[in-house]
């Protein structure tokens, strides 16, 4: 057994640009408090998974009111350490979550409102009994400076608080089978401490925290006698089928405690030790209130202080669920129009628009031709978020800046040969064809559907009827 201790040194704006806004204002003065959650091992569990090693809540800090125009300073802190007692061995490796909470002290009629300002988390190795370890963690624009240590509660010692020491009964040596307790040479290793409440008469242990029953006794604390019948097997209790020594039903059999409560036997019945947030004879009543800090990801808790009060979490953008624990993929709703790319930045959605579109959701179709000129006499044609130039004869490319090869499209029909010319193209037609693109056959009787060739041109010569 022992205690994990956390000392908060400062909470305020981190270095660098973008100092955070003060969490308090003249209209809404507030004060801070901290919550620490510990889990064994180097687990990367979700923030809402149980704090299996324990959790603690600090006292409230002094009331703070922002000075208008002043940058957010280091905020006033609560006094004292946060202490998380642990009953079993210290695991050596652990995960922590430290949350900074703001308590608003405006004139809310329903009592104060709580909201999460910052959450830091980490995984560390730490031996019990060592010196204070210092740490700095950043959460957004905030910076938290703190120290922590684990110490064993007497009589436990060692890096895991599993060795037990007692003052020597005799000045010279320890009892049979017990070694001196280094570094406390004047103390001796003590016998193991069994589970709390384990019957000293009917129980024993071979590991700390264990409770194993002697013959004839049962139950988690070896306080329930095994019911006997008229026969006894020579080897002690036998199975129920023989009718000998059948264990009697214990009040904790089947664990009557709901919601993760632990059952312990009492002389008359049983008692449930309920986890935080539950109460009632069998831990069946949920009593989570805003004081338990149920809202994650900066959700604002609304609810009364009475355990019967309901609570709701007012979630920031990008989160949903009854405790703001679920991240929303807001881009799955495809909010960006006209093929825009959606970016979920957490605090806001951004759309990266395709060329020719603008607006928060790319909803505005820009005048594609505005400020765009088509060269060499081309004309601009709008459409589809991109401008297009319809080029004059002899020019091509996006802006009509490239000289076109008029023959590239093979414009001369019926095997005519194409020649580029400063004023366009010229087709030299194959025998039997004529026309600007060699599209007309020459009539079989030698007559043509077109006027006779001008003087100086034979029928096979290039035709320039353009």
């Amino acid at each position: 057994a022992g205690v994990f201790e956390l000392q908060i040194h400062s909470f305020g704006p981190g270095p660098g640009p973008g100092a955070p806004r003060s969490p308090c204002s003249a209209r809404l003065p507030c004060r801070l408090f901290f919550r620490v959650c510990l889990k064994p091992g180097l687990s990367e569990e979700a923030a809402e998974s149980p704090c299996a090693l324990g959790a603690a809540l600090s006292a409230r800090g002094p009331v703070y009111t922002e000075q208008p125009g002043a940058p957010a300073p280091d905020l006033p802190l609560p006094d004292g350490l946060l202490q998380v007692p642990f009953r079993d061995a210290w695991p050596g490796t652990f995960s922590f979550i430290i949350e900074t909470w703001r308590e608003e002290l405006g004139d809310q009629i329903g009592g104060p409102a709580w909201s999460l300002l910052a959450r830091v988390a980490g995984r560390r190795r730490l031996a019990a009994g060592g010196p204070w370890a210092r740490d700095i963690q950043r959460a957004g624009a905030w910076e938290l400076r703190f120290s922590y240590r684990a110490r064993c509660e007497p009589p436990a010692v060692g890096t895991a608080c599993t060795r037990l020491c007692r003052p020597r009964s005799a000045p010279s040596r320890c009892g049979p089978g017990l070694r001196p307790c280094a570094p406390l040479e004047d103390e001796c290793e003590a016998p193991l401490v069994c589970r709390a409440g384990c019957s000293p008469e009917h129980g024993f242990c071979e590991q700390p925290g264990e409770c194993r029953c002697l013959e004839g006794w049962t139950g988690p604390l070896c306080t329930v006698p095994v019911s006997t019948s008229s026969c006894l097997s020579p080897r002690g209790p036998s199975s129920a089928t023989t009718g000998c020594l059948v264990p009697g039903p214990g009040p904790c059999d089947g664990n009557p405690c709901a919601n993760g409560g632990s059952c312990s036997e009492t002389p008359r019945s049983f008692e449930c030790t309920c986890p935080r947030g539950f109460y009632g004879l069998r831990c069946e009543v949920s009593g989570v209130t805003c004081a338990d800090g149920p809202c994650f990801n900066g959700g604002l808790c609304v609810g009364g202080a009475d355990p019967d009060s309901a609570y709701i979490c007012h979630c920031p953008p990008g989160f949903q669920g009854s405790n703001c624990e679920k991240r929303v993929d807001r881009c799955s709703l495809q909010p960006c129009r006209n093929g825009g790319l959606c970016l979920d930045l957490g605090h806001a959605l951004r759309c990266r628009c395709r060329a020719g579109f603008a607006g928060p959701r790319c909803e505005h179709d820009l005048d594609d031709c505005a400020g765009r000129a088509c060269a060499n006499g081309g004309t601009c044609v709008e459409g589809g978020g991109a401008h297009r130039c319809s080029c004059a004869l002899g020019f091509g490319g996006r802006d009509c800046r490239e000289r076109a090869d008029p023959c590239a499209a093979r414009p001369c029909a019926h095997g005519g040969r194409c020649y580029a010319h400063f004023s366009g193209l010229v087709c030299a037609c194959a025998p039997g064809y004529m026309g600007a693109r060699c599209e007309f056959p020459v009539h079989p009787d030698g007559a043509s559907a077109l006027p006779a060739a001008p003087p100086g041109l034979r029928p096979g010569d290039p035709q320039r009827y353009l």
């Epitope: 709701i312 979490c313 949903q320």
Partner: nanobody
């Protein structure tokens, strides 16, 4: 300052029903968390039922299964249907709405349940 306006309270026999309404008001929009609080004489005010801005509902343990909260965003109105009323439900019921910056309250409506 804009205030919320409750209606529907009154005197009812144990086991009876009442339906409280709040609004219409431009405050009661889907981006706000809304709820019904109650305060009995000599006791602190507690949230009976609420709907968060993301649509999650929650109820006080003592009213679960008997009370139903709902909102009509088109009509900017909040409701609380109260069935199987008990004498311990006697209190002043307040309509409530909030966003991250502000919170809004009604003046309250009295609900009295006779044994």
């Amino acid at each position: 300052e804009v205030q919320l306006q409750e209606s529907g309270g009154g005197l009812v026999q144990a086991g009876g029903s009442l339906r409280l309404s709040c609004g219409p008001s431009e405050i009661i929009t889907s981006d706000k968390s809304v709820g019904w609080w109650r305060q009995a004489p000599g006791k602190q005010r507690n949230l009976v039922a609420g709907i968060s801005n993301v649509g999650s509902t929650n109820y006080a343990q003592s009213v679960k299964g008997r009370f139903t909260i709902s909102r009509d965003n088109a009509k900017n109105t909040l409701f609380l249907q109260m069935n199987s009323l008990k004498p311990e439900d006697t209190a002043v019921y307040y309509c409530y709405a909030r966003d991250f910056e502000n919170e809004y309250w009604g003046r309250g409506t009295q609900v009295t349940v006779k044994p």
